[in-house]
C-alpha cells in the first residue's frame, strides 16, 4: 500500500511557532512497540500455492540494516497435485515501508527517513484476461 | 519479516564523540525516494484464491497518517469453481514497518519511531497437519 507524500505539514511546527532551525527536527531515541513481533506460520513461503524465496539486502547505514525481499518462484500456481497450473498467476504483494538512513561526517550524525518498496510475499490470482490463443 | 532491535549502536555517535544531548537525534526534513510507488496488479485482493478486505486506520499524529490493514475473507481458499476449499488455509502475510509518531507540547515538537505490524495481504497454503476430524 502507498505511503502518501509528506507535504509540508506533518514535520512542521504550528504557524504561530518559530520555524525549525537548519531544516532538521528532534528525533527521540528509542522505538515505540519495539518488542512487537510478526507471528506468521512456519514456512508459509514454501507451503503457499504461490511459493516464494527470500533475498536479504544488508546496509549498515540503514535501520533496519536487513531488508528482506520476496520473489515469486513460479509464473503460475501450484495445484493439489504439486504441479504448476499456468491458468493461474503467482503475483507479488508489495508494501511501501519506511527505513532510517544514517548520514555522518566525523562527529556530526544525522538521520533521514527513506521510503523502501518491499515485496512481502506472493498470492495466487485468477488472470483478468482470458484471451483467444 | 522482523525488524531487529535497535540495540545501542545505530543511533549513537562514535565513542570518541560527545554523547547526543537530551536523548534525541537530528532528523533531516524530507524523505528519500518519496515518489517511489507500489505497482501491484489491479484488484489482487478480490482476484486472489485467498481474498482479503482492507481496513484503513487514521492517526493525524502518525506518519503515514493512513495505515492500511488487510483481513483474509475466508478460513479456507477459493477453488477453480469459486467454492471454498476448507482443506486449505487463507493465511495473512505480515510485515513489520516503521512509522513516525509526532509528540508536541506547545511549540516543542519531537518525533519518535514506532514499530507497526501490518497485514499486507493473504496467501493460500497447504496445512502441515492433516488431522482426523
Amino acid at each position: 500500500r502507498k505511503i502518501p507524500k509528506v507535504g509540508h505539514t506533518f514535520f512542521q511546527k504550528p504557524e504561530s511557532c518559530p520555524p525549525v532551525p537548519g531544516g532538521s527536527m528532534k528525533l527521540d531515541i528509542g522505538i515505540i512497540n519495539e518488542n512487537q513481533r510478526v507471528s506468521m506460520s512456519r514456512n508459509i513461503e514454501s507451503r503457499s500455492t504461490s511459493p516464494w524465496n527470500y533475498t536479504v539486502t544488508w546496509d549498515p547505514n540503514r535501520y533496519p540494516s536487513e531488508v528482506v525481499q520476496a520473489q515469486c518462484r513460479n509464473l503460475g500456481c501450484i495445484n493439489a497435485q504439486g504441479k504448476e497450473d499456468i491458468s493461474m498467476n503467482s503475483v507479488p504483494i508489495q508494501q511501501e515501508t519506511l527505513v532510517v538512513r544514517r548520514k555522518h561526517q566525523g562527529c556530526s550524525v544525522s538521520f533521514q527517513l527513506e521510503k523502501v518498496l518491499v515485496t512481502v510475499g506472493c498470492t495466487c490470482v485468477t488472470p483478468v484476461i482470458h484471451h483467444v490463443q | 519479516r522482523k525488524i531487529p532491535k535497535v540495540g545501542h549502536t545505530f543511533f549513537q555517535k562514535p565513542e570518541s564523540c560527545p554523547p547526543v544531548p537530551g536523548g534525541s537525534m537530528k532528523l533531516d526534513i524530507g524523505i528519500i525516494n518519496e515518489n517511489q510507488r507500489v505497482s501491484m496488479s489491479r484488484n489482487i485482493e478480490s482476484r486472489s484464491t485467498s481474498p482479503w478486505n482492507y481496513t484503513v486506520t487514521w492517526d493525524p499524529n502518525r506518519y503515514p497518517s493512513e495505515v492500511v490493514q488487510a483481513q483474509c475473507r475466508n478460513l479456507g481458499c477459493i477453488n477453480a469453481q469459486g467454492k471454498e476449499d476448507i482443506s486449505m488455509n487463507s493465511v495473512p502475510i505480515q510485515q513489520e514497518t516503521l512509522v513516525v509518531r509526532r509528540k508536541h507540547q506547545g511549540c516543542s515538537v519531537s518525533f519518535q519511531l514506532e514499530k507497526v505490524l501490518v497485514t499486507v495481504g493473504c496467501t493460500c497454503v497447504t496445512p502441515v497437519i492433516h488431522h482426523v476430524q
Partner: nanobody, 125 residues
Framework: EVQLVESGGRLVQAGGSLRLSCAAS????????MGWFRQAPGKEREFVAA????????AYTDFVRGRFTISRDDARNTVYLHMTSLKPEDTAVYYC??????????????????WGQGTQVTVSS
C-alpha cells in the same frame, strides 16, 4: 499479546438460547481469525466454531451447525457465539481463542495461541 475475556455463560433450560461474548484487548483484534471451543467434564477440549479475520466466513462443527452462530464486531473488539435450541449435551466450559498459526485447518486447536479463561454453560433438562 492479546487478552480475551468471555462472558454470558449461565444455567439455561433445554431448548433455550444464550449469547456468549469474548472481549479482546491488546494487539489488533482484526489480525486474527477467532474461534470458540468447549470442554465438557472429563472430555477433551473440542472445536465449536470459527470466523475469519474479516468476518466474511464462518465454520462450525457438525453437532452445532444450524443451532449456533459465530459473529464478530471489530469496532467493539468482540466475538460472539449465539447459541439456540440448546441441549443438555451442550453443557461445558466455552473458551474463546485467537488463531495465530496455520499449521492445521481452522479447527486445529494448536493453531490457537491466545485463550480466555472460559465461561460455564449449563443446560438443564
Amino acid at each position: 499479546e492479546v487478552q480475551l475475556v468471555e462472558s454470558g455463560g449461565r444455567l439455561v433450560q433445554a431448548g433455550g438460547s444464550l449469547r456468549l461474548s469474548c472481549a479482546a484487548s491488546g494487539r489488533t483484534f482484526t489480525s486474527y481469525p477467532m474461534g470458540w471451543f468447549r470442554q465438557a467434564p472429563g472430555k477433551e477440549r473440542e472445536f465449536v466454531a470459527a470466523i475469519s479475520m474479516s468476518g466474511d466466513d464462518t465454520a462450525y462443527t457438525d453437532f452445532v451447525r444450524g443451532r449456533f452462530t459465530i459473529s464478530r464486531d471489530d469496532a467493539r473488539n468482540t466475538v460472539y457465539l449465539h447459541m439456540t435450541s440448546l441441549k443438555p449435551e451442550d453443557t461445558a466450559v466455552y473458551y474463546c481463542a485467537a488463531r495465530t498459526s496455520y499449521d492445521g485447518t481452522y479447527d486445529y486447536i494448536d493453531d490457537y495461541s491466545y485463550w480466555g479463561q472460559g465461561t460455564q454453560v449449563t443446560v438443564s433438562s
